[in-house]
């Protein structure tokens, strides 16, 4: 059974994941982002079901494409480069989903834009956090 300290750690990790996903979304949605139109042409796979931590496998599998789209910004002036954000997200996702069991991700038939994709995973984090508090 999960202890209160492990639940607290999971909650903190989910909060950090949520914050970085929101930061990416904010950067994309920024009205000054000249590459937004092009970014929206890229399609992302959405999970058929995302209700448990093991479903983060579906996010992990899309992190490389996410980084590639973020690199379109081609700014020489990053506080944080896309790879910094994606690397941190990857570490958190690996810790949250665990590596004991191998879960085969099932994707929905419809693909999504980067904005829809990020919003889906933001909602996932918020949902899981709400069950822990």
């Amino acid at each position: 059974a999960p202890t209160s300290s492990s639940t607290k750690k999971t909650q903190l990790q989910l909060e950090h994941l949520l914050l970085d996903l929101q930061m990416i979304l904010n950067g994309i949605n920024n009205y000054k982002n000249p590459k937004l139109t092009r970014m929206l042409t890229f399609k992302f796979y959405m999970p058929k079901k995302a209700t448990e931590l093991k479903h983060l496998q579906c996010l992990e599998e899309e992190l490389k494409p996410l980084e590639e789209v973020l690199n379109l910004a081609q700014s020489k002036n990053f506080h944080l480069r896309p790879r910094d954000l994606i690397s941190n997200i990857n570490v958190i996702v690996l810790e949250l989903k665990g590596s004991e069991t191998t879960f085969m991700c099932e994707y929905a038939d419809e693909t999504a834009t980067i904005v829809e994709f990020l919003n889906r995973w933001i909602t996932f984090c918020q949902s899981i956090i709400s069950t822990l508090t």
Epitope: E15, H16, L17, L18, L19, D20, L21, Q22, M23, I24, N26, G27, N30, K32, A73, S75, N77, F78, H79, L80, R81, D84, L85, S87, N88, I89, I92
Partner: nanobody, 119 residues
Amino acid sequence: EVQLVESGGGLVQPGGSLRLSCAASGSIFSINVMGWYRQAPGKGRELVAAISSGGSTNYADSVKGRFTISRDNAKNTVYLQMNSLKPEDTAVYYCAYASSFYEDETDYWGQGTQVTVSS
């Protein structure tokens, strides 16, 4: 409006350590990047290290393995632990606050704190 107050600068010998702090107050947005930049005499301002509210970090190559950035989201404070300091680390260190990960959209800068590494 966000206010940034830096502290911890000073004079230190080569090989020594310092810990800088930057406390943000005012209209703080929970999703942000806080970081440290520095400007040596006659040079441009350069990134030292930055950290997101989610814990993503970025370091300048020249400080990797020597400097560590961390933050306390509850206190809206960012820290820079500087070890194995070198004379070339001498500069004014500025705290930065941004709601985006793009540097050219930095919202606020601190006043700066002087770090001098000299024997």
